[in-house]
């Protein structure tokens, strides 16, 4: 059985479309599971992995490896 584009698995009922945009950064494995690109995490691979040590409470990042501080916090790790 050959599945339609972006459909995977037995019965072709698993859907996965690789993407690299605001809504996700992932490839699809042979079973149609999302595999996050380097630097991204979460079920949809749309959450950047911040600089190692970046304060989870006072820092955040839009892009992998970044660490942007909340107002009132500073330093390499916003701590």
């Amino acid at each position: 059985v050959t599945c339609d584009d972006y459909y995977y698995g037995f019965g072709c009922n698993k859907f996965c479309r690789p993407r690299d945009d605001f809504f996700g950064h992932y490839a699809c494995d042979q079973n149609g599971n999302k595999t996050c690109m380097e630097g991204w995490m979460g079920p949809e691979c749309n959450r950047a992995i911040c600089r190692q040590g970046c304060s989870p409470k006072h820092g955040s990042c839009k892009l992998p490896g970044d660490c942007r501080c909340q107002y009132g916090w500073q330093g390499l790790y916003c701590d």
Partner: antibody
Framework: QVQLVQSGAEVKKPGSSVKVSCKAS????????MHWVRQAPGQGLEWMGA????????AYAQKFQGRVTLTADKSTSTAYMELSSLRSEDTAVYYC????????????WGQGTLVTVSS | DIQMTQSPSSLSASVGDRVTITCRAS??????LAWYQQKPGKAPKLLIY???TLADAVPSRFSGSGSGTDYTLTISSLQPEDFATYYC?????????FGGGTKLEIK
Amino acid sequence: QVQLVQSGAEVKKPGSSVKVSCKASGYTFTDYEMHWVRQAPGQGLEWMGAIQPGGGGTAYAQKFQGRVTLTADKSTSTAYMELSSLRSEDTAVYYCTRRGYDDYPFAYWGQGTLVTVSS
Amino acid sequence: DIQMTQSPSSLSASVGDRVTITCRASGNIHNYLAWYQQKPGKAPKLLIYNAKTLADAVPSRFSGSGSGTDYTLTISSLQPEDFATYYCQHFWSAPWTFGGGTKLEIK
């Protein structure tokens, strides 16, 4: 279970701004974008934009670029939509909405917030 | 931007009828299409996603089909609770635009 609870109805003057909140519960707030969709009285649905609460990244429909600001407060799991320079045609119900698991489109919706713009 | 054209804009039918609503995209959306049902004063409810997959707890009388640019929502046997407005929406790339809606009314 996933719940999105929005702030109450607002009446605003033309030229002013409105800020609508959407409190999320039942899932990890930073794992999914929060989208905003509006519906004018008797009209269809219009996608306005989305925010990734984890890092604050945003995507906006071109029509609203520069007039809408999406923000998120991770500490309270609350997303906000602020619309400025209001005009009468912005009178609408504003919904926050979230994708489902496994790339569903909008499986979860807030109850909607009616914003009335009138002089 | 991809535009969605939905037809008809309104439709009168009777309980038990088979009803078809169509949606055409201005570009290939590769099955990245959803259908929603909306009742007055309520938020839309997801019916179908990825063109043909039924969302949780949606009755099997609803079905979706299509590919490329042309998609169809079919209700095999209308029930009284099905009278509502239906919207298609693509989610291939931002902006995730909706069709104009189809108001399904009792004949």
